[in-house]
């Protein structure tokens, strides 16, 4: 596969990826961080200046939400 | 009008390994993400893993990780599921599928499926 | 992994009968649920998308309803060509998951 991915590619690996569930650009708030100071990664950031497998790419994934309790 | 034209049926040792192929005839192969299905007999649908050719992304269900690999030839439009380290519960049909948008998983156009024998 | 469980796994009814199967997600997977109906020997054909979505070409005594986790689908009057196997699958998040199967068996 090709080394980075970019605008339309880098839109249907997420969906791909995640499903239907959707996907950030940019990790949530503290995703992964613990400064609260530290820079915001993002995906193209990770995935079309540099290159990223898919593991990278499911970090941008949406949360699964809860089921609803009874 | 899309067609996804399996590979024949297989008879496999257990312990040995299976490459069933799946050709795409219709439409435009490289960015639209097929995907695997096994049915055992008399059994539900199991989705093994996906791939979008263009890309060369595939993933993978957990439980077939380091198993199975699926792989494209954009020059025939053809996927691959290759499956190793059979064994008897393995036995089953296998079907490619394949959605309406590069990304779906809304399986408008299966394969004829591949019944793959594992007997020892 | 999200489970998908489908009730009853096994019905009998009649031509002309009205019949509602249901799905239930482990998870949330809001409306991203499909249906898929299976004759012996055949593949699956795409029946219902995105819950209450009808696939182009399918008939429309066939209808979809449900979001969140529970789910069904109704077959309005039931035909002779209906009888199969009916499964449910979320898109919601993979690995893609499928109910066990609703086998629509003749009374």
């Known amino acids: 596969g090709p080394e980075t991915l970019c605008g339309a590619e880098l839109v249907d690996a997420l969906q791909f990826v995640c499903g239907d569930r959707g996907f950030y650009f940019n990790k949530p708030t503290g995703y992964g961080s613990s400064s609260r100071r530290a820079p915001q990664t993002g995906i193209v950031d990770e995935c079309c200046f540099r290159s990223c497998d898919l593991r990278r790419l499911e970090m941008y994934c949406a949360p699964l939400k809860p089921a609803k309790s009874a | 009008q899309v067609q996804l034209q399996q590979s024949g049926a297989e008879v496999k040792k257990p312990g040995s390994s299976v490459k069933v192929s799946c050709k795409a005839s219709?439409?435009?192969?490289?960015?639209?993400?097929i995907s695997w299905v096994r049915q055992a007999p008399g059994q539900g649908l199991e989705w093994m893993g996906g791939?979008?050719?263009?890309?060369?992304?595939?993933n993978y269900a957990q439980k077939f990780q380091g198993r199975v690999t699926i792989t494209a030839d954009e020059s025939t439009s053809t996927a691959y599921m290759e499956l190793s380290s059979l064994r008897s519960e393995d036995t089953a049909v296998y079907y490619c599928?394949?959605?309406?948008?590069?990304?779906?998983?809304?399986?408008?156009?299966w394969g004829q499926g591949t019944l793959v024998t594992v007997s020892s | 992994d999200i489970q998908m469980t489908q009730s009853p796994s096994s019905l009998s009814a009649s031509v002309g009968d009205r019949v509602t199967i249901a799905c239930r997600a482990s998870?949330?997977?809001?409306?991203?649920l499909n249906w898929y109906q299976q004759k012996p020997g055949k593949a699956p054909k795409l029946l219902i998308y995105?819950?209450?979505s009808l696939q182009s070409g399918v008939s429309s005594r066939f209808s979809g309803s449900g979001s969140g986790t529970e789910f069904t689908l109704t077959i309005s009057s039931l035909q002779p060509e209906d009888f199969a196997t009916y499964f449910c699958?979320?898109?919601?998040?993979?690995?893609?998951?499928f109910g066990q199967g609703t086998r629509l068996e003749i009374k």
């Open positions: 599928a394949r959605g309406p948008r590069g990304y779906s998983y809304n399986f408008d156009y």
């Open positions: 219709g439409g435009t192969f490289s960015s639209y993400a």
């Open positions: 791939i979008i050719p263009i890309l060369g992304i595939a």
């Open positions: 998870q949330t997977i809001s409306r991203y």
């Open positions: 995105a819950a209450s």
């Open positions: 699958q979320q898109t919601y998040s993979p690995p893609i998951t």
